[in-house]
Interface confidence: low
């Protein structure tokens, strides 16, 4: 027999199917030009020493074969002895290791069997009424197709589905959409209405995310506030990656989950912009303010659930820098200016009360005064910090107040409002004999001691009523007792206590008169 012809003789090997699970499969035969035809197949198993024979039986019952050797593709013309206008049955027999392995048969009319392509190029994926819709342009000159899809998840095998007949320049398919797992889809096509026509190859994988993006499971840590008044937000644990089916691992366009970080600065509510959304990869610097942070996951179908955290305010206070002067017209604060043209936000809130009671004031952009200080003043009538209680004050600064991530903390401190000197006056001063020349003085703590860092010291003053001599004794703010010694018996003394702040001298308490009795010896 000539190699270009189908040989109508017995093939050169015994006729016995081994029944092996390996062997030829997926036989496809097509017309590739006006007078040429091609059959191709796949072979599963070791290929060494395998010879393939394309078998063909005509409707008359006569059968022939082409010897393909080790190739799994064979071309022949319409002059090869195979009837191309009538139905023929084709299969592949592979002779290997002294046994024959047969492919499943295909029965078709070769002349009308056109090689169909799978969907090529861009397959658009969208969601439609809880289902997945895939759409693609019909390959050139191939309008009229049956389309199938197969899909799998990371934990399930391939499942086959039907897209139905297609008869347009664009083709589409409705497929199941999984709620919580990614899917891999592949599509294939074959000629519509042509009995026995071969399926195309499967398309490249189409990777589809779950309808619901995975809830982000991340953990943050916040570094300490630096000298510049900013602290870095760092990601301690990356979001768990979506598990992907086998064909989507590596590069899987379509299944990407985007994680965005939404910052909400809770402090300083009087500023222009309170929220900002960033990519999770770009971790921001924050001021020492309180923030709510949300991580929002989204995929091509939209946003999913978010995970939220509260980042408390940095309450580390410096014994700095805030000078407060109280005058008849009002109160002025002074602090070291940050830079030229800075906007400051001054926030205050009564200590021990809900953060919702914070009040703030935004300054106009200001330059440092000649002493390098920035200032904020308010009148008594404004009522700001007017009550005799402890306030927590934070001052934030920004050259770009509209940008949430560019605020920094200038300082945090405590301030006792209202008439601090009067309210801070120590009460319940008492004097007790201690020895022949000393007494013990103690008092109830000043109201100022409720405000951390505000009470600088107590001062105890003792006055000799005879000589009018006065002595003053500083006492640590944590102490409420002192021993006065070197006193003389029979002399009248008065004692008073004062509570001082860094910027304000307190009001003396009511004078306490006492004397040490003269001891009469027997």
């Amino acid at each position: 027999c000539r190699t270009s012809e189908c040989c109508f003789q017995d093939p050169p090997y015994p006729d016995a199917d081994s029944g092996s699970a390996s062997g030829p499969r997926d036989l496809r035969c097509y017309r590739i030009s006006s007078d040429r035809y091609e059959c191709s197949w796949q072979y599963e198993g070791p290929t060494a020493g395998v010879s393939h024979f394309l078998r063909c039986c005509l409707s008359s019952g006569r059968c022939c074969y082409f010897a393909a050797g080790s190739a799994t593709r064979l071309q022949f013309s319409d002059q090869a002895g195979v009837s191309v206008l009538y139905t023929v049955t084709l299969w592949v027999e592979s002779w290997a290791r002294n046994q024959t392995e047969k492919s499943p048969e295909v029965t078709l009319q070769l002349y009308n069997s056109v090689k169909y392509e799978p969907p090529l190029g861009d397959i658009k994926v969208s969601k439609l009424a809880g289902q997945l819709r895939m759409e693609w342009e019909t390959p050139d000159n191939q309008v009229g197709a049956e389309v199938q899809f197969r899909h799998r998840t990371p934990s399930s095998p391939w499942k086959l589905g039907d897209c139905g007949p297609q008869d347009d320049d664009t083709e589409s398919c409705l497929c199941p959409l999984e709620m919580n797992v990614a899917q891999e889809f592949q599509l294939r096509r074959r000629q519509l209405g042509s009995q026995g026509s071969s399926w195309s190859k499967w398309s490249s994988p189409v990777c589809v995310p779950p309808e619901n993006p995975p809830q982000p499971q991340v953990r943050f840590s916040v570094e300490q506030l630096g000298q510049d008044g900013r602290r870095r937000l760092t990601l301690k644990e990356q979001p768990t990656q979506l598990e992907l089916p086998e064909g989507c691992q590596g590069l899987a366009p379509g299944t990407e989950v985007t994680y965005r970080l939404q910052l909400h600065m809770l402090s300083c509510p009087c500023k222009a912009k309170a929220t900002r959304t960033l990519h999770l990869g770009k971790m921001p610097y924050l001021s020492g303010a309180a923030y709510n942070v949300a991580v929002i996951s989204s995929n091509q179908f939209g946003p999913g659930l978010n995970q939220t955290w509260h980042i408390p305010a940095d309450t580390h206070t410096e014994p700095v820098a805030l000078n407060i002067s109280v005058g008849t017209n009002g109160t002025t604060m002074y602090w070291p200016a940050r830079a030229q043209s800075m906007t400051y936000c001054i926030e205050w809130q009564p200590v021990g009360q809900d953060g919702g009671l914070a009040t703030c004031s935004l300054t106009a952009p200001q330059d440092p005064d000649p002493a390098g200080m920035a200032t904020y003043s308010w009148s008594r009538e404004s009522g700001a910090m007017g009550q005799e209680k402890c306030y927590y004050i934070t001052i934030f600064a920004s050259a770009h107040p509209e940008k949430l991530t560019l605020w920094s903390t200038v300082l945090s401190t405590y301030h006792f409002g209202g008439n601090a000197s009067a309210a801070g006056t120590p009460h319940h001063v008492s004097v007790k004999n201690h020895s022949l020349d000393s007494v013990s003085v103690d008092w109830a703590p000043s109201l100022l001691s409720t405000c951390p860092g505000v009470l600088k010291e107590y001062v105890v003053r003792c006055r000799d009523e005879d000589s009018k001599q006065v002595s003053e004794h500083p006492v640590q703010p944590t102490e409420t007792q002192v021993t006065l010694s070197g006193l003389r018996a029979g002399v009248a003394y008065t004692v008073q206590v004062r509570a001082d702040t860094a910027w304000l001298r307190g009001v003396w308490s009511q004078p306490q008169r006492f004397s040490i009795e003269v001891q009469v010896s027997d």
């Epitope: 699970a21 390996s22 599963e44 198993g45 070791p46 197969r150 990371p154 934990s155 399930s156 095998p157 391939w158 499942k159 086959l160 598990e243 086998e246």
Partner: antibody, heavy 119, light 110 residues
Framework: QVQLVESGGGVVQPGRSLRLSCAAS????????MHWVRQAPGKGLEWVAI????????YYADSVKGRFTISRDNSKNTLYLQMNSLRAEDTAVYYC????????????WGQGTMVTVSS | QSVLTQPPSVSAAPGQTVTISCSGS????????VSWYQQLPGTAPKLLIY???KRPSGIPDRFSGSKSGTSATLGITGLQTGDEADYYC???????????FGGGTKLTVL
């Protein structure tokens, strides 16, 4: 030739452990999901466990969950079943089976290895 | 108790036709492909039908499969004494994330 060969069966006392192996040849082992299926004497087939391609996902029948562990070593073309806390009802022929690439059919089966749990 | 239900036994004379049913639910047969396995006495199971109705190479066309809704059927025509075996249906169960089998049907050729 595509082949699966199980080993490691034998007689074991209740509460003890046993490890079965399944050596694969003639195909790309790392591309296929693999099953363990068992058959008690005179009874039907009972699926035991499956492990996917790279070993990143595993599922078990409720009857063995927490006691049996399926694993694979793709570099050695070998599937394993670690069986702990064995019970009399685990007595069976244990088959390993290959999952077809294109569907959920088990297209290749081993010859089986007998496990007898008896005191 | 198997997830899939098969008749325990069927019998017919040589040359006759026999069918074996397999019923399940939407989470298994309803949404997944059914496979059929033949187990000749003393041997390992062998794949007979996959994807509801396809035959692997080497399986004669006397064996056929079909599926409708949540049930599947194996058909064997031209019965031969060599067909005496246990036949099992199997499929994936999407809810259980497990492979499920029927209890098996013993075919006797009279």
């Amino acid at each position: 030739q595509v082949q699966l060969v199980e080993s490691g069966g034998g007689v074991v006392q209740p509460g003890r452990s046993l490890r079965l192996s399944c050596a694969a040849s003639g195909f790309t082992f790392s591309s296929h999901g693999m099953h363990w299926v068992r058959q008690a004497p005179g009874k039907g087939l009972e699926w035991v466990a499956i492990i996917w391609y790279a070993g990143n996902k595993k599922y078990y029948a409720d009857s063995v969950k927490g006691r049996f562990t399926i694993s694979r070593d793709n570099s050695k073309n070998t599937l394993y079943l670690q069986m702990n806390s064995l019970r009399a009802e685990d007595t069976a022929v244990y088959y390993c089976a290959r999952e077809s690439l294109l569907n959920s059919a088990s297209d290749i089966w081993g010859q089986g290895t007998m496990v007898t749990v008896s005191s | 108790q198997s997830v899939l239900t098969q008749p325990p036994s069927v019998s017919a004379a040589p040359g006759q036709t026999v069918t074996i049913s397999c019923s399940g639910s939407s989470s298994n047969i309803g949404n997944n492909y059914v496979s059929w396995y033949q187990q000749l006495p003393g041997t390992a199971p062998k794949l007979l039908i996959y994807d509801n109705n396809k035959r692997p190479s080497g399986i004669p066309d006397r064996f056929s499969g079909s599926k409708s809704g949540t049930s599947a059927t194996l058909g064997i025509t031209g019965l031969q004494t060599g067909d005496e075996a246990d036949y099992y249906c199997g499929t994936w169960d999407s809810s259980l994330s497990a492979v499920v089998f029927g209890g098996g049907t013993k075919l006797t050729v009279l």
